[in-house]
């Protein structure tokens, strides 16, 4: 069990003026990376 407070979606982070690179540097899990690249694909 367990888990944690789910991270805010990438779009929210961008609103906070975080760069894509700084977001990339924080990714930890496979799911984190999958969501990140899904967002990048969707923003093209």
């Amino acid at each position: 069990g367990g888990g944690g407070s789910k991270h805010k979606c990438v779009q929210n982070s961008l609103v906070n003026n975080e760069t894509l690179e700084s977001i990339m540097n924080t990714l930890e899990s496979e799911e984190d990376f999958r969501k990140y690249f899904y967002y990048l694909e969707g923003s093209k």
């Epitope: 944690g4 407070s5 924080t26 990714l27 930890e28 990376f33």
Partner: antibody, heavy 119, light 107 residues
Framework: QVQLVQSGGGVVQPGRSLRLSCAAS????????MHWVRQAPGKGLEWVAV????????HYSDSVKGRFTISRDDSKNTLYLQMNSLRAEDTAVYYC????????????WGQGTLVTVSS | DIQMTQSPSSLSASVGDRVTITCRAS??????LAWFQQKPGKAPKSLIY???SLQSGVPSKFSGSGSGTDFTLTISSLQPEDFATYYC?????????FGGGTKVEIK
């Protein structure tokens, strides 16, 4: 069930090196980032380092940067902490810990392994 | 770095007491706060995540609240097994940082 079993602690002289291991089971180890946290005798908890899925991202506390290296071997489901140029202030119990991803809390911890740096 | 300040650093309480521990972040961390319990010679045990969500298997006598910079952990009715040290931790950003701990002792 999730298990994180640590090994590699011991007594080492200042300036020498030591490698800690954390063997994981009960979950898809390769899919998750892993952390090291330490606790000096009688003191509080201090975050040390993190390694992401695939080893893509690594971050360290300022106190160990340039001396410690975090790594992983997904084929062995094992996390490592290579500690070089050890100092007396590195004496602590070291814990490995797992969380689901960035901005998630730790859900599982290893049992801890004591590193004593002394001449 | 985000500093986490816990208070009190220690407290004495009796079985059955309601105990509250506070944790303050030096800057806003939304609800990215966890609480851990640690007994001597043991690894920390995760109690609460997301400031107020109970980890699986943790009894409901533990509760957490707060958001932004101010947080609390409450034990509604202290039991003998609850005498331990409690730590808060922010996981909003690297480096992850912990409070200094609160030791809950028997009065």
């Amino acid at each position: 069930q999730v298990q994180l079993v640590q090994s590699g602690g011991g007594v080492v002289q200042p300036g020498r090196s030591l490698r800690l291991s954390c063997a994981a089971s009960g979950f898809s180890f390769s899919s998750f980032g892993m952390h090291w946290v330490r606790q000096a005798p009688g003191k509080g908890l201090e975050w040390v380092a993190v390694i992401s899925y695939g080893g893509i991202n690594k971050h360290y506390s300022d106190s160990v940067k340039g001396r410690f290296t975090i790594s992983r071997d997904d084929s062995k489901n094992t996390l490592y902490l290579q500690m070089n140029s050890l100092r007396a202030e590195d004496t602590a119990v070291y814990y490995c810990a797992k969380r689901e991803g960035y901005r998630y809390a730790y859900d599982y911890w290893g049992q801890g392994t004591l590193v004593t740096v002394s001449s | 770095d985000i500093q986490m300040t816990q208070s009190p650093s220690s407290l004495s309480a009796s079985v059955g007491d309601r105990v509250t521990i506070t944790c303050r972040a030096s800057q806003g961390i939304s609800n990215y706060l966890a609480w851990f319990q640690q007994k001597p010679g043991k690894a920390p045990k995760s109690l609460i995540y997301g400031a107020s969500s109970l980890q699986s298997g943790v009894p409901s006598k533990f509760s957490g609240s707060g958001s932004g910079t101010d947080f609390t952990l409450t034990i509604s009715s202290l039991q003998p097994e609850d005498f331990a040290t409690y730590y808060c931790q922010q996981y909003n950003s690297y480096p992850l940082t912990f409070g200094g701990g609160t030791k809950v002792e028997i009065k």
